[in-house]
């Protein structure tokens, strides 16, 4: 089981939208996958994916979760507020028959105040 996460760094304006992406790869077939997003070490959500279907669409404040088979998990924060700033990590686990866990690298999200005097563009930095 492996997890690749991006971007490494995401800088967005307050009130806009932030999208964090996670790719989960598993060598053997799984019946039920458990995915998890954490922010600053606290769990936002940890739903199951069964038969390609996500059991829960909400993930933390203003967070929406989506799963695109076979391997893409997306967390969309909309609208972004200042307290969305932090370090996000995507995890995946197969719990049955044996536990197998994997975690992604950190995505650092920076949220700029909605200051009309500043004209700062959105910055996204992906690995590789």
């Amino acid at each position: 089981l492996s997890v690749q996460q991006g971007p490494n760094l995401l800088q967005v304006r307050q009130g806009s939208q932030a999208t964090l992406v996670c790719q989960v790869d598993q060598a053997t077939a799984w019946e039920r996958l458990r995915v998890k997003w954490t922010k600053d070490g606290a769990i936002l959500c940890q739903p199951y994916i069964t038969n390609g279907s996500l059991s829960l669409g909400v993930c933390g404040p203003q967070g929406r979760l989506s799963w695109q088979a076979p391997s893409h998990l997306t967390l969309q924060l909309d609208p972004v507020s200042l307290n969305h700033s932090g370090a996000y990590v995507c995890w995946a686990a197969v719990e049955i028959p044996e536990l197998e866990e994997a975690e992604g690298n950190i995505t650092r999200l920076f949220v700029d105040p909605d200051d009309p005097t500043q004209n700062r563009n959105r910055i996204a930095s992906f690995p590789g």
């Epitope: 606290a42 936002l44 959500c45 739903p47 199951y48 059991s55 933390g60 719990e95 049955i96 536990l99």
Partner: antibody, heavy 118, light 107 residues
Framework: QVQLVQSGAEVKKPGSSVKVSCKAS????????INWVRQAPGQGLEWMGW????????NYNEKFKGRVTITADKSTSTAYMELSSLRSEDTAVYYC???????????WGQGTTVTVSS | DIQMTQSPSSLSASVGDRVTITCRAS??????LNWYQQKPGKVPKLLIY???RLHSGVPSRFSGSGSGTDFTLTISSLQPEDVATYYC?????????FGGGTKVEIK
Amino acid sequence: QVQLVQSGAEVKKPGSSVKVSCKASGYTFTSYDINWVRQAPGQGLEWMGWIYPGEGSTNYNEKFKGRVTITADKSTSTAYMELSSLRSEDTAVYYCARRGLRYYFDYWGQGTTVTVSS
Amino acid sequence: DIQMTQSPSSLSASVGDRVTITCRASQDIRNYLNWYQQKPGKVPKLLIYYTSRLHSGVPSRFSGSGSGTDFTLTISSLQPEDVATYYCQQVNTLPWTFGGGTKVEIK
């Protein structure tokens, strides 16, 4: 701070049911699994099952399947464990415990003593 | 179910002694092993997870090691407040199971 507060001691007759509650505070209840573990007098710990309150999904120890039901009420941040067809061997302290970031129990309730006696 | 066997079931040691508790799994559980401490009349407390990772707030005199089927909890210098029963737990395979416990007393 994270707290799990359980309901009070119960005395039950064989064949009856008991429902123990576990009220969570200090964290987002819907984000973390709540597990139930029991400990018979002078004995070790025995895992019974868990619930993920975010969606109500459960996983039970086969030993208790059919007799145990774990539920959660999101509106009150409370998890429940109901054990039916009680027998004397079910006399134990029942704990709720939160599963942490990984697969371990980082916070525990204070325990609820259930005594099964005729 | 995976059986977890702890040894010894009880031990008595002096303050400052190095204490070692072992836990053996009936089959390979890789590193999915946790250790808990339960003081008399109290609730279990997490000490170590994933074989060797110290839970926050746990004194550094506690350490864990092992992999596969054989695991060890070590208290490098026993303190009076360490009097308790220690339990290992495997979370590799459902149902999760605990060892029978090791009771640690002060001589």
